[in-house]
Interface confidence: low
């Protein structure tokens, strides 16, 4: 139909720091090049309906939906969103096109939905449909990076199949141990997918996107280092690629390296070698063993041998599914009020876990440290001596693990009391859990030494919020004690606390704290 106007629908994505957004709802400043939304004529619809490509927006992002109309004469318009009409002010750009804009500031769930734009020009009427939804980050993934050899080159490619596309970086370090921590000056980062310098001491590849950051270390056996007391172990899942690097330095080039799996030489195509001279003219050789997709029969002892160094091995274990191995029995601890103490969980897991420590419905960050024996450890020290239940939770792609801890703080009881018309109750959270005595104060017993044993009921209850035990004792009021002062005392191995209560007729009860 030649009468139909030429329509262009665009999206303008405003960066968060864009101060120009929303200054004029009809003509916001453009902070980024507009993205074409297509605006195709919708077939089989009554009337002329154009449909723009669906727009998915981050929570709190700001966007402008804009329509450019190439049609002669004036236009009038109306926006409709969720059955409400919204003001529409068209204007003309330098090419004399009609421009209609809808600014959405700081996207929220309530702003998601269908935006209908009705346009009336001198020639015809038509409708434009925009669908705006909040971007669903649940569709996102962040997968641990893995390595591939670059075709026809001695270089490694780092790949992470993640959504959205991650930023990949190599993290390189040439010193040993602690100095290779992430923020150390010895660490060099290269934001690229391909790495040619493969002689470094410690090589990791990391991928990051909106979900966080995941890293994979290039497993290395260094023949110049003293072997670990326990054999290094590498876990992989069926189908994952295997990469082990063997590295050796010698005074000259007169040495060679070989890989064996269970005393059989690796097949050609499953290894490649590189060598270079270091600054002090010694020779560095590295020999990579790799399998592009491991199967169960790739399990075994991989041994790197040298004609000039003692050989070293690593145990490669191929598993069908990931796992988390740790003892899940709950553990109870009893510490003094100022004693230094940390909870700790020792575990073996593959792939690497994500974990949290939780206390009283509040989660705390979880750090994990690799041990030499293939195990990892996570410690939690930030309990601030608060008694109760602490939970360690870990998960990876295939497994979940939860472990409960109870922390008891040894301390003298503290007593709180309350009373009603028929009974008086005392509460204490000291530890060990206290025992109770009730005493009556009278003319005969001004020091409150007359013990009450009738009508006393003791119990312990778990205060659910913190998971800590509270002991209570209740005295049912009888005629014999009405109008008297009574004293409840809680005692344990660390001391005694008491509270005195006046048991008068019904009504508010004053409490007299006993020092």
């Amino acid at each position: 139909n030649q009468d139909l106007p030429v329509i262009k629908c665009v999206l303008i994505n405003h960066k968060n720091n864009d101060s120009s957004v929303g200054k004029s709802s009809s003509y916001p400043m453009v902070s980024e090049s507009p993205e074409d939304l297509g605006c195709a004529l919708r077939p089989q619809s009554s009337g002329t309906v154009y449909e723009a490509a669906a727009v998915e927006v981050d929570v709190s992002a700001s966007i402008t939906l804009q329509v450019l109309v190439d049609a002669p004469g004036n236009i009038s318009c109306l926006w409709v969103f969720k059955h409400s009409s919204l003001n529409c002010q068209p204007h003309f750009d330098l090419q004399n096109r009609g421009v209609v804009s809808m600014v959405i500031l700081k996207m929220t769930e309530t702003q998601a939905g269908e935006y209908l734009l009705f346009i009336q020009s001198e020639a015809t009427n038509y409708t434009i449909l925009f669908t705006v939804s909040i971007r669903n980050t649940l569709l996102y993934t962040l997968r641990r990076p893995y390595f591939r050899k670059m075709e026809n080159q001695d270089a490694l490619v780092c790949i992470s199949e993640s959504v959205p596309e991650p930023i990949v970086e190599w993290v390189l370090c040439d010193s040993q141990g602690e100095s290779c921590k992430e923020e150390s000056p010895a660490v060099v980062k290269k934001e690229e997918k391909v790495l040619h310098e493969l002689f470094g001491t410690d090589i990791r590849c990391c991928a990051r996107n909106e979900l966080g950051r995941e890293c994979t270390r290039l497993f290395t056996i260094d023949l110049n280092q003293t072997p670990q007391t326990t054999l290094p172990q590498l876990f992989l899942k069926v189908g994952e690629p295997l990469w082990i690097r063997c590295k050796a330095v010698h005074v000259n080039h007169g040495f060679g390296l070989t890989w064996e799996l269970e005393n059989k030489a690796l097949e050609e195509g499953n290894y490649f070698e590189m060598s270079t001279y270091s600054t002090n003219r010694t020779m560095i050789r590295i020999l990579f063993a790799f399998v592009s997709s491991v199967a169960r029969n790739d399990t075994g002892y991989y041994t790197c041998s040298s004609s000039k160094h003692p050989s070293q091995s690593a145990l490669v274990t191929i598993v069908e599914k990931g796992f988390i191995n740790a003892t899940n029995s709950s553990e109870d601890y009893e510490i003094d009020q100022y004693e230094e103490f940390c909870f700790s969980v020792r575990f073996k897991a593959y792939p690497q876990i994500r974990c949290t420590w939780t206390f009283s419905r509040k989660s705390f960050p979880c750090e994990q440290k690799g041990l030499d024996n293939g195990y990892s450890i996570s410690k939690f020290c930030n309990h601030k001596h608060q008694p109760g239940e602490y939970i360690f939770h870990a998960e990876n792609d295939d497994a979940q693990f939860t472990k409960m801890f109870t922390l008891n703080i040894r301390r003298k009881p503290q007593v709180l009391a309350e009373a009603s018309a028929s009974q008086a109750s005392c509460f204490s959270d000291g530890y060990p859990l206290p025992s109770w005595t009730w005493k009556k104060c009278s003319d005969k017993s001004p020091n409150c030494t007359e013990e009450i044993t009738e009508g006393v009921w003791n119990r312990k209850a778990n205060r659910k919020v913190f998971g800590q035990w509270v002991s209570s004792s209740t005295l049912n009021m009888s005629e014999a004690i009405k109008g008297f002062l009574v004293k409840c005392c809680a005692y344990n191995s660390l001391g005694t606390s008491c509270e005195t209560i006046l048991l008068n007729s019904p009504g508010p009860f004053p409490f007299i704290q006993d020092n």
Epitope: E35, A53, E56
Partner: nanobody, 125 residues
């Protein structure tokens, strides 16, 4: 890796009904946009219907609107396609698909990450 297994295909007369099911292997099923595509002999694979991860949004090809209904049960990791008033032109291999947008701001079509093997639906008298 999500494995998708379709079932429920078969021979049905024009005007008849059929329900296809798609069982997903992964417990993260509920985080994927799920959909149905079909491929008739000698034709390209075409979109039939899709449903957002929460079930809050559904999308249909014009050719099946009003006749087909997509639904999902996240607790059973299963996607369904209820097909009523079937026509001869609905004959095709029906594929279950899982995926989601990789775009940061604009999504024109979901990027399908995983496909099922397909189940054949034949509408014939």
């Amino acid at each position: 890796e999500v494995q998708l297994l379709e079932s429920g295909g078969g021979l049905v007369q024009p005007g008849g009904s059929l329900t296809l099911s798609c069982a997903a292997s992964e417990r993260t099923f509920s985080s994927y946009t799920m959909g149905w595509f079909r491929q008739a002999p000698g034709k390209e694979r075409e979109f039939v219907a899709a449903m957002s991860w929460s079930g809050g949004s559904t999308y249909y090809a014009d050719s099946v609107k009003g006749r087909f209904t997509i639904s999902r049960d996240n607790s059973k990791n299963t996607l369904y396609l209820q097909m009523n008033s079937l026509r001869a032109e609905d004959t095709a291999v029906y594929y279950c698909a899982a995926g989601g947008s990789t775009r940061v701001v604009v999504t024109t079509t979901p990027v399908v990450k995983y496909w099922g093997q397909g189940t054949l639906v034949t509408v014939s008298s």
